[in-house]
Each structure stands twice: as C-alpha cells, then as structure tokens.
Amino acid sequence: MSSKYPRSVRRCLPLWALTLEAALILLFYFFTHYDASLEDQKGLVASYQVGQDLTVMAAIGLGFLTSSFRRHSWSSVAFNLFMLALGVQWAILLDGFLSQFPSGKVVITLFSIRLATMSALSVLISVDAVLGKVNLAQLVVMVLVEVTALGNLRMVISNIFNTDYHMNMMHIYVFAAYFGLSVAWCLPKPLPEGTEDKDQTATIPSLSAMLGALFLWMFWPSFNSALLRSPIERKNAVFNTYYAVAVSVVTAISGSSLAHPQGKISKTYVHSAVLAGGVAVGTSCHLIPSPWLAMVLGLVAGLISVGGAKYLPGCCNRVLGIPHSSIMGYNFSLLGLLGEIIYIVLLVLDTVGAGNGMIGFQVLLSIGELSLAIVIALMSGLLTGLLLNLKIWKAPHEAKYFDDQVFWKFPHLAVGF
C-alpha cells in the first residue's frame, strides 16, 4: 500500500509554498524593474549563455549528482529543481535589497540572475547532506535561511573586506559545505533497522548521478569565471579550471582503483572526485599563471577527494548521520579550504616577493574572511537544523528516510522501481 504524505503536511506544504510564492510575486511587483538600457543583442546572448551554463549546472548537474540513492532518485532531482527555482527568486530580491535598494527599486539584470543562480547553488550543495531525511516544507525553510545567510555574508565581506564579486562568491564552497554538515548534525541520525537498503546506491540512479557529475565537469569553468571583471581574468579562469578538472578526473579514477584492495573503481569516489580540481582552483583560478600549476592542484585535489571519500564517510555517518554516498559536504569542505589556502599562499608569496607589509595585511584579511564564512555557515546551519526539528514541519519518520514513495505518486507500486 502506498505511503501518503502525512495529512498535516498535505495541508502545510502547498499553503506554505504558495503563500511564499505569492509574497515573492508581490515583492517583485512593488520593488523590482528590468534594466531599461538598449544593449547589443549579441552581447546579451553571450551574457545569457553564462547564466544558462550555471542553470544547467544547478538543475541537471547537482540535481542528478544527488540522485544515486536506490529509492530516492526522483525526490533528489525534483527537490533540487524546486529549491533552485525558489532560491533564485529569493536571492534576486535579497541581493537587490542588500546592494541597491537605498537608491529606489531593485534593477534586475542578467548579472543579478547569474548571481542569484550561484547563491541558489549553495543550497543545492548543502542539501546533499540532508536529502532523504527532510520533506519539501523543511527544504523551503532551508532555502530561505541559507540564501539569506549567504547573501548577508557576501554583503559583509564586500563592505568590510572590500572583496570583489568573484572572491566573495568563491566562499560558497566552504560556506555550503559547513552549512550542510551543521544542518545534518542537528537532524535525527540513526537509520532504523530495515531501512539500510534505501541509502544504498543502485545502478541506474548511479548512472544518472554520473551524468550529473559530467554536466558539472563540463560547466565548472563557467562557474569559476562567471563573476570575473575582465576578459583576461575570465580566460585564465576557464583554462585553469579546465586543466584542474581534467587532471582530477584522471586522479579520481586511478586513485579510486588504487584505494580498493582489488583495484576496483568506486562510483561514489568518482562522482565527487571528478569535480575536485574545479573546487580547489575556484578562488585563485584567474590568478594561476600557468597550466602546470592548475594541473598540480587538480592532482592534489583529486587525491584529497579520493582519500576523503575512503576515510571520512565512516566518521560522517556516525557523527552526522550522512549516508556513504552523500560525500559532497565533506568533499567540498576539504577542497574549499584547500582553494582558500592556495589563495592565501599566493598572498604570502606576494608579501615575501614585495617585502610589502600591506600585502601581509591582505593575508590577515583573507584569513578573516574565511573564518567569518565558516562561522556564519556553522551558526546559520545550526539555526536551520534547529528550525527543521520543529514538529510543525512533520518531518518524515526515520523509517521513511530515503523513500520516494513518501512523496511521489507511482502508477505501479513495485518496490524495485
């Protein structure tokens, strides 16, 4: 017999989501307008393509990457789309209110949509740690809190540390990872007897997760270069990211084989490790002066990712209740930190080279930025976790974790769909 949504959630979710959507529509009506300038149509299309790449990464890439659970693949993809759609709307408004509102209405440009998509991507990275253990109503809360926290973090970093769009958005990796891990820490952890099979991966969902990884792999250069100010910086970012992810694929596959006693390749390792280089070069992708450095970074990132995938899941499963296949959280937390450290190393090398105390001051500022990102991520994540534990949301019972049938109508209720 089919498992239905609890009656209270059936009332709560549509009401909650549609009320929120109506509120967003009203906010857009009163406070936003489009950029009225006449622009070069070719330029407009080129600019839109960057945003399109980001949307593909978010909707298909991250959507499918998280779909490897045997009994939770539908929910992973669709819930990701739901969160992306909601997150982009709220992020556009929030960014506008925080950055331009004092001057009147919020002007919506392709750039603001680009920024909003990247902000929403943060939620999709974080949610990997909790997907399967929460319902849509809870995910709405998570979207609102995380986008708000990230938006405020970016504004604070921009105003206090005077960081440009690219640098303050590249904290997204560390922020999203720690946010997701701290939310997961707050949620009920133990998987009851009889549900262990649900958080296992299956062949077809794993293939779709690989498809997601491929989309992310293809478009990662767009993500790392999207917010850079000059063509030369974007060109460097695209090249360096491409070299880094190329090497991390080779490292992921060979490293995964090396890590296995029989030399077999783990799907889970490969899903995340192929992206390792892109995350690791993110912060300094436009600054790396030659391909070989980006390639070395890709190699190191791939090894860290495979090593992390081998040794960290046990710890994460015990402490945070994160299933073995949801390794994006700790993967991004390690690789995001690596990326930030690379940038700090570049600053230190500048200090040594220039003998300039000011660049030393920049090192302290960068460490301050990183620390602030981690602190805000942990605090807002814990707050979200506490909110998600409220009875009002009617969270799925632990026995219903990682189960599409709780949320979806299937014409035939065969267990092995």
């Epitope: 330029g43 960057v50 440009t109 005077n162 100010r229 030369i232 910086e233 600054l287 000011m358 660049i359």
Partner: antibody
C-alpha cells in the same frame, strides 16, 4: 593609434534628456570594461559610471543613479550614456575611458583608465 | 575611499624635483593610479598600481607608497610637465579621484 571619440553633447534644458556616444577605433571594445568620467568647468575629475566588458554589470555614482544609464553595443564598437532628468550640476565635459587591467602581483589584478576620449561638453541650462 | 592631495598647487622651475602626495581615507593597498591633465586636453595615465610606469611615459615619473600614503615624483621637471595631476583609487567602487594638484611655472 587606439582612440575613443565621444559625441552627443550639447546645450539642454533642466529635466530633459541627452544621449552620449563613444566610438572605439583601432581596438575591440568587447575586450574592455568602460568608464564615463566628467569634469565640471574649473573642477576636478569625477567618475560617473562603469560597465563590464560584456555589459553584464554596471555601477553608477550616487548622484546619477536612477537618472543615467550606461550601455554598450559591442557589435558597433560603441559605448553609450543615456542621461535623463538632467540638472544644472550635470554640466561638464564628459569623457569615456577604457579600463586596462594588469596582473602586477601573484595574487591580484590592478585596474586603471589607460585610454581616454577627447571629451564632449554637456551644458544644462534654462 | 576618499582621496586628498597635497599641495593643491605648486610652482616649480624646469629641472626641479617635484613631489606630490595623495592620502586615502582608508587602506587601499597598492590600488592607486596617477594621471596628468593639460588644459583643454583629456587625462593621460602615468602610473598604475602605485608604482608601475605606463608604457610610453618618461622614466622621470615615478610612484611609491601603499596603504594610505602615496607619492608621485617627477625627478627633473620638464616644460611639458606643467599640468594638473590626479590620483585615483581602484580599490573599491566608486573609483574616486583626488582633487588634483596643479603644477605651474615659478
């Protein structure tokens, strides 16, 4: 030689509109961010607006926000400044300037205005 | 960051060593540029990133400083150097200019 040529200036009444153009020659406009800078008679330089190389992002000086709009048509190698609701204090010579960038150190790019137009005069008077 | 320049004007003779200072209201690292403007002409970039000489600019022009205090030095003033000099920060938006220093003949 790399050049920027402004046009569209003139005498206009307060509250009216004017559109300035800046045509680039001997270089591809798409490769550069572009600024508008103005200079009131007998005064110093004042930055007005900036647009990214692909037109995706724009910045304005507070006093012109909501009244001025910077745009570009990269296929025509031309930059524009649409000025609405003009005020007497907008009277100035308006320059367009190309943004150059260079990676001087390992960890940063530096930005500067390396090519300037000859300027076009805008007089707002009743 | 707001910029102030000193002196606002100075008189000097050909061959003199001239120093113009620019102070920022907050630290701008090395994100400072210097421009020269002659009457009726458009500005011309001299120095970027506080101390890097723009190509085609004579080596008698040099820049130094970081943080909040910067200096433009003309080692031996030439007749064509009589002009107004502006500093400009590119550290934050808006990329503000200093009020200018007018260098004229003594």
């Amino acid at each position: 030689e790399v050049q920027l040529l402004e046009s569209g200036g003139g005498v206009v009444q307060p509250g009216r509109s004017l559109r300035l153009s800046c045509e680039a020659s001997k270089f591809t406009l798409y490769n550069y961010g572009m600024h508008w800078v103005r200079q009131a008679p007998g005064k110093g330089l004042e930055w007005v607006a900036f647009i990214w190389f692909d037109g995706s992002n724009k910045y304005y000086e507070d006093s012109v926000k909501g009244r001025f709009t910077v745009s570009r048509d990269n296929s025509k190698n031309t930059l524009y400044l649409q000025m609405n609701s003009l005020r007497a204090e907008d009277t100035a010579v308006y320059y367009c300037a190309r943004e150059g960038s260079k990676k001087v150190a390992l960890s940063r790019y530096y930005y500067y205005m390396d090519v300037w137009g000859q300027g076009t005069t805008v007089t707002v008077s009743s | 960051a707001e910029l102030t320049q000193s002196p606002s004007s100075l008189s000097a003779s050909v061959g003199d060593r001239v120093t113009i200072t620019c102070r920022a209201s907050q630290s701008i690292s090395s994100y400072l540029n210097w421009y020269q403007q002659k009457p009726g002409k458009s500005p011309k970039l001299l120095i970027y990133a506080a101390s890097s000489l723009q190509s085609g600019v004579p080596s008698r022009f040099s820049g130094s400083g970081s943080g909040t205090d910067f200096t433009l030095t003309i080692s031996s003033l030439q007749p064509e150097d009589f002009a107004t000099y502006y500093c400009q920060q590119s550290y934050s938006t808006p990329p503000a200019f200093g009020p200018g220093t007018k260098v004229d003949i003594k």
